[in-house]
Interface confidence: low
Amino acid sequence: LRLLDFPAPVCAQEGLSCRVKNSTCLDDSWIHPRNLTPSSPKDLQIQLHFAHTQQGDLFPVAHIEWTLQTDASILYLEGAELSVLQLNTNERLCVRFEFLSKLRHHHRRWRFTFSHFVVDPDQEYEVTVHHLPKPIPDGDPNHQSKNFLVPDCEHARMKVTTPCMSSGSLWDPNITVETLEAHQLRVSFTLWNESTHYQILLTSFPHMENHSCFEHMHHIPAPRPEEFHQRSNVTLTLRNLKGCCRHQVQIQPFFSSCLNDCLRHSATVSCPEMPDTPEPIPDYMPLWEPRSGSSDYKDDDDKGSSHHHHHH
């Protein structure tokens, strides 16, 4: 979680002098409660926007917007605290709108916006706007919260953001998998324009089960420049296990911009004559996780073999 470094955020508007300050997420009014506090924000809206940094990088940002209730409590409104909590890490970042003048009228509905919180692809956040000062311990809450889910890098606009491009979002491997005779799978995919190696992660399952019955990892060395954008063909030998017939093939690149945290692409071969819709493998995984879930091998003698070549 971080703040956009450019342009400087602005909260002042006609009829209000205001400045944006970094916050520790612990406003003084928590420690020293006030007798009279403002009412809560109204109509909190969170939207996905995109913003360029000074260096020209494009990032997804949370566009936060809310209005004030049309009551007399604006006379006691000293500002607002905006808090963004990343749900999977419990990381929190806050900023404070500090009002330098008093609000004295409702000639028009007061509306506030802030678009400087940089968010990550495929992450969920809780956005909270607290009006300041915060209420006394038993007072009515004067905040509003909303959850905000950022799309993953498959989303059309997200795909061209810097974090997604850094993780390899522009690479489309166009994976094809076909079953050959003698317990073999032929995997074909398009190489990217970088001399980096790839891993193919094969996970096989019985029909209608999510416990794996076979796994194999196959390493593909870095292609030469003349092989960029060419198809690479790999033949994987499967374990001859009755019923171990549904195969998930995941290709993990190791691009220089993302190394062991690049976006993965996957394809599935269903069991013959029994159409099946398996759980998809998450595409956004760290190096050490071929897939989520617990391991439950049906066969301990796990010796797959494979060979590959680049096709011109």
């Epitope: 990343q86 911009s257 993302c258 190394l259 945290d261 995984m285 190096l287 996780e289 391991s295």
Partner: antibody, heavy 118, light 107 residues
Framework: EVQLVESGGGLVQPGGSLRLSCAAS????????MNWVRQAPGKGLEWVSF????????YYADSVKGRFTISRDNAKNSLYLQMNSLRDEDTAVYYC???????????WGQGTTVTVSS | DIQMTQSPSSLSASVGDRVTITCRAS??????LAWYQQKPGKFPELLIY???TLQSGVPSRFSGSGSGTDFTLTISSLQPEDVATYYC?????????FGPGTKVDIK
């Protein structure tokens, strides 16, 4: 030179808290997943926690789940381990370690010692 | 969770001897296994990854083999500087468990 330097260890009472830091240098920290591993005095290695490069995936050992929080700040090239509700059995040298592309952990810090005692 | 066991827990051998350490996973882990060497008072060092791939800079007397549940670390000719504790570690999925270690010293 690729380097990891841990800090923040010390003596703390049972039930107390500590925050460990790991400063990374010499490599593109924001592209790497990271781990915390610990070693109790005279004992073996115990994996503690994992965080992926963009914090999108996090794992904990059962022994620390609900008490420890791993986080990172890629802008500061730093990895953190917030340790709450510390117990005697958390006494150990804590290492941060970088996973190698292809598997295993190829870069380790020198470790920071955490002692939980009343 | 998958358990990792190592045997023996300790061994003494002479300089030049061939030393073999085994690591067993309670369930198959394909070739998602690493071996580490830790000398007294030092941090661990990666020797082998992907069960059999030698880490850059590691002497060729070290080798790894195995797949599925049974893995072996072999030191073809034990040297005095090989006195250390050796650990295996699985990394197919969390938790990334280490074996209990094998302490190797010179007779």
């Amino acid at each position: 030179e690729v380097q990891l330097v841990e800090s923040g260890g010390g003596l703390v009472q049972p039930g107390g808290s500590l925050r460990l830091s790991c400063a990374a240098s010499g490599f593109t920290f924001s592209s790497y997943s990271m781990n915390w591993v610990r070693q109790a005095p005279g004992k073996g290695l115990e994996w503690v926690s994992f965080i992926s490069a963009r914090s999108s995936t996090i794992y904990y050992a059962d022994s620390v789940k609900g008490r420890f929080t791993i986080s990172r700040d890629n802008a500061k090239n730093s990895l953190y381990l917030q340790m709450n509700s510390l117990r005697d059995e958390d006494t150990a040298v804590y290492y941060c370690a970088r996973p190698k592309v292809g598997g295993g952990m190829d870069v380790w810090g020198q470790g920071t010692t955490v002692t939980v005692s009343s | 969770d998958i358990q990792m066991t190592q045997s023996p827990s300790s061994l003494s051998a002479s300089v030049g001897d061939r030393v073999t350490i085994t690591c067993r996973a309670s369930q198959g882990i394909s070739n998602y296994l690493a071996w580490y060497q830790q000398k007294p008072g030092k941090f661990p060092e990666l020797l082998i990854y992907a069960a059999s791939t030698l880490q850059s800079g590691v002497p060729s007397r070290f080798s790894g083999s195995g797949s599925g549940t049974d893995f072996t670390l072999t030191i073809s000719s034990l040297q005095p500087e090989d006195v250390a504790t050796y650990y295996c570690q699985k990394y197919n999925r969390a938790p990334f468990t280490f074996g209990p270690g094998t302490k190797v010293d010179i007779k």
